[in-house]
Interface confidence: medium
Amino acid sequence: QLTTESMPFNVAEGKEVLLLVHNLPQQLFGYSWYKGERVDGNRQIVGYAIGTQQATPGPANSGRETIYPNASLLIQNVTQNDTGFYTLQVIKSDLVNEEATGQFHVYPELPKPSISSNNSNPVEDKDAVAFTCEPETQDTTYLWWINNQSLPVSPRLQLSNGNRTLTLLSVTRNDTGPYECEIQNPVSANRSDPVTLNVTYGPDTPTISPSDTYYRPGANLSLSCYAASNPPAQYSWLINGTFQQSTQELFIPNITVNNSGSYTCHANNSVTGCNRTTVKTIIVTELSPVVAKPQIKASKTTVTGDKDSVNLTCSTNDTGISIRWFFKNQSLPSSERMKLSQGNTTLSINPVKREDAGTYWCEVFNPISKNQSDPIMLNVNYNALPQENGLSPG
């Protein structure tokens, strides 16, 4: 069955429509298109001869029509007067004619919309904002987009006025957008330019960086303060409660132990009128803020039980540190056979017993830092009966 299909069925004025043909017979001599629901020579648009690949315009041809070898008809720059029925007549190679009729509708194209707002500089958690999509037109669907995505389900988002108005209740800093509205009719869709919100917020609780607490005498102390805020926050520094300066960064060269104390960053947003502070403790000390990883060594790692002794040594280049020992996650010494010497640097086990087999490690620490060695495994063997000549039986 020969059929035609309009692509699209609903056409925007000024655009084009393709009258597609389905189930076109294989053996054809040619075809003709007519305006209307029947074949009428006075309303012929175009004829096409397959053999000559030649299109011949008819009385109803407007110059906007193109016929293709597959019998499809393209009409460009359509007007509302083009709305209606179109009939295709096919001349088959058995000289029997076949006809099919289709139709399409032409609608005016929609303009590009725009967004109006009742407040483009709202305050976070305080203000509401209403967006309205312009213009208001009949038979039009209004859609909204936030960050190029359709509206999420949220109690803070309300649509009204036939979806033409979008209201944001109690805006947050994440509501900056961009916002776009789209208008649609059966044939066209048009999206507005994006609109963004300048949401005023903050300051949040400031963060002082770097996070270091311990400094050596003679070092430079450089602290930076940041608090999320719109507009950007104004900063000031206090040391031990005494105002120092109104900058985002604080720099003190060649510090001494006297520079130890509490450092306060104060952030202020002049628009919201809000203030936030953060206090950081700085300690200036000779002690190493980072203790290096110690090395552990054993006089031997495989010993004979009830006979041998073993010495484990914990080595470090750091000064002013203490050492402690661990065996199977227990602190040592745990028996009278274990002795610590040379400022806990050496752990001696004498004699070694079966229960001493396992993993040992040491830890070095000072008041502000610690570090532990890699573990070392101690193996404890018990001899069987001695073999003559030390040879295994053969």
Epitope: L28, F29, G30, G47, I50, T56, S93, L95
Partner: antibody, heavy 121, light 111 residues
Framework: EVQLLESGGGLVQPGGSLRLSCAAS????????MSWVRQAPGKGLEWVSV????????YYADSVKGRLTISRDNSKNTLYLQMNSLRAEDTAVYYC??????????????WGQGTLVTVSS | QSVLTQPPSASGTPGQRVTISCSGS????????VSWYQQLPGTAPKLLIY???KRPSGVPDRFSGSKSGTSASLAISGLRSEDEADYYC???????????FGGGTKLTVLG
């Protein structure tokens, strides 16, 4: 019964003119494309020209372009071939033939009996 | 020289099957329908096959046409003495915007 009857052939000198006619009967002449086909003595068929059913589309063989003119009068059910600047190589039997495809894919289902044109001095 | 190429002659005995070939190009046979015509001595041509393989009413089914690519063939089975005639293939040529014929094949029925 479909009938095509050619007339107007004869002897003509080189450079001369002749007008052939083909009277059609037994079918709706205005619904069919029509062609002229010629055959030189002892030679094969050579297509000359075609005219669409309404007369809006016309094609010629390269060998006759500018010298031969096809036309039709649907009210008289008659096809014509005006022959000018005739040459010796135009000597042939001229057949009119009906195209049942309305010119969409020319094929010739009915032929006249032919009329002989001789171009000689 | 004809645009479509046919063998100048062919022959066969009564009852035999004979095939006549017709070779062209993409602008004619390759993309357009082929017709075959029979011309008995001293008469006007008669349409045997149109649209590559279709027979007009009144043409015996001993006559069949086929096409592959840029070549076409006319087959006559059960050959009869009255089939002795000239046979022409024809097709529209899209490049030259004109109808072209083969040079014709003279079929002789022997015996």
């Amino acid at each position: 019964e479909v009938q095509l009857l050619e007339s107007g052939g004869g002897l003509v000198q080189p450079g001369g003119s002749l007008r052939l006619s083909c009277a059609a009967s037994g079918f709706t002449f205005s619904n069919y494309a029509m062609s002229w086909v010629r055959q030189a003595p002892g030679k094969g068929l050579e297509w000359v020209s075609v005219i669409s059913h309404g007369g809006g589309s016309i094609y010629y063989a390269d060998s006759v372009k500018g010298r031969l003119t096809i036309s039709r009068d649907n009210s008289k059910n008659t096809l014509y071939l005006q022959m000018n600047s005739l040459r010796a190589e135009d000597t042939a039997v001229y057949y009119c033939a009906r195209d049942p495809t309305k010119g969409y894919a020319p094929t010739f289902d009915y032929w006249g009996q032919g009329t002989l044109v001789t171009v000689s001095s | 020289q004809s645009v479509l190429t046919q063998p100048p002659s062919a022959s066969g005995t009564p009852g035999q099957r004979v095939t006549i070939s017709c070779s062209g190009s993409s602008s004619n046979i390759g993309n357009n329908y082929v017709s075959w015509y029979q011309q008995l001595p001293g008469t006007a041509p008669k349409l045997l096959i149109y649209a590559d393989s279709k027979r007009p009413s009144g043409v015996p089914d001993r006559f069949s046409g086929s096409k592959s690519g840029t070549s076409a063939s006319l087959a006559i089975s059960g050959l009869r003495s009255e089939d002795e005639a000239d046979y022409y293939c024809g097709a529209w040529d899209s490049m030259g915007n004109g109808y072209v014929f083969g040079g014709g094949t003279k079929l002789t029925v022997l015996g």
